[in-house]
């Protein structure tokens, strides 16, 4: 199961990086329902993460790297939440 989860994460991450390079960011992820805020991150009145734009005007390698790492962390948190929720739901049956 963990291998499957890692596979999903890596595939999702690759797709998001493709979108980042094309300047699309997380719009299509939102359409597929991968939105939502991070635990311990933005508060209840936060703008949906999906609506946030790029991290400014910098296009150097360090800025790109930090954005990529942020996306990876974000997806790991979102998919981790989903996985935990599935396990929780199965346990209730």
């Amino acid at each position: 199961r963990r291998d499957v989860a890692h596979g999903i994460l890596n595939e999702a991450y690759r797709k998001v990086l493709d979108q980042l390079s094309a300047g699309k960011h997380l719009q299509s992820l939102v359409a597929r329902g991968v939105g939502g805020s991070l635990g311990g991150g933005a508060g209840d009145d936060a703008e949906p993460l999906s609506k946030r734009h790029s991290d400014g005007i910098f296009t150097d390698s360090y800025s790109r790297y930090r954005k990529q790492m942020a996306v990876k962390k974000y997806l790991a948190a979102v998919l981790g939440k989903r996985y935990k929720q599935r396990v929780k739901n199965k346990g209730r049956r």
């Epitope: 609506k51 790029s54 400014g56 910098f58 390698s61 360090y62 930090r66 962390k73 974000y74």
Partner: antibody, heavy 110, light 111 residues
């Protein structure tokens, strides 16, 4: 421009939350960082928050500080404050800290 | 955490002269070029001058330039002006952002 608020005199151990707001640009469009400067000393990088809400902190933070954001604010929550945390706290835009606020002074004293 | 060591303060310069400030990192910065330079005047917040080791930030005069790679970096001010009197800081960005740190600062005095 960027503006910090919430700095004040507190006693050791008192938690404190600083707030960063922006005018002239959409705060939610940028990663935001926090930096501090003790009186007469140099700059110290605290950490930053991405547009996705993910955070990174300097190794010395040890979980005492938490950065979070909404669509209009970025906050720095500080716990277990000691006199060593007395400093001016700056909020700055994006990973390269290209636009800074004037800072807000936090004084920790008994 | 990384340690960034800057040229000791103060550094003196004559108007029209050239100032060189060095910044040495205890470990290589990300992609060998993730280093920025800031200028801070008393009572003011820092101002970004250079990022990615050598890229001039928007609105910064061309008399400021940055160079270096890996662990050794230099900020050069050519044709120094009175307005350049300030403290200059370098900031290193690393593979693990937990290592990010500023140098101790170098004060530039203009005669």
């Amino acid at each position: 421009s960027v503006e910090e608020s919430g700095g004040r005199l507190v006693t050791p151990g008192t938690p404190l939350t600083l707030t960063c707001t922006a005018s002239g640009f959409s705060l939610s469009s940028y990663a935001m960082g926090w930096v501090r400067q003790a009186p007469g000393k140099g700059l110290e990088w605290i950490g930053d928050i991405s547009t996705y809400g993910t955070t990174d902190y300097a190794s010395w933070v040890y979980g005492r500080f938490t950065i979070s954001r909404t669509s209009t604010t970025v906050t720095l929550k500080m716990t277990s404050l000691t006199t060593e945390d007395t400093a001016t706290y700056f909020c700055a835009r994006d990973y390269w800290l290209s636009l800074w606020g004037q800072g807000t002074l936090v004084t920790v004293s008994s | 955490a990384a340690v960034l060591t800057q040229t000791p303060s103060p550094v003196s310069a004559a108007v029209g002269g050239t100032v060189t400030i060095k910044c040495q990192s205890s470990q290589s910065v990300y992609d060998n070029n993730a280093l920025a330079w800031y200028q801070q005047k008393p009572g003011q917040p820092p101002k970004l001058l250079i990022y990615a080791a050598s890229t001039l930030a928007s609105g910064v005069p061309s008399r400021f330039s940055g160079s270096g790679s890996g662990t050794e970096f230099t900020l050069t001010i050519s044709g120094v002006q009175c307005d350049d009197a300030a403290t200059y800081y370098c900031l290193g960005g690393y593979y693990d952002p937990a290592d990010n740190a500023f140098g101790g600062g170098t004060e530039v005095v203009v005669k």
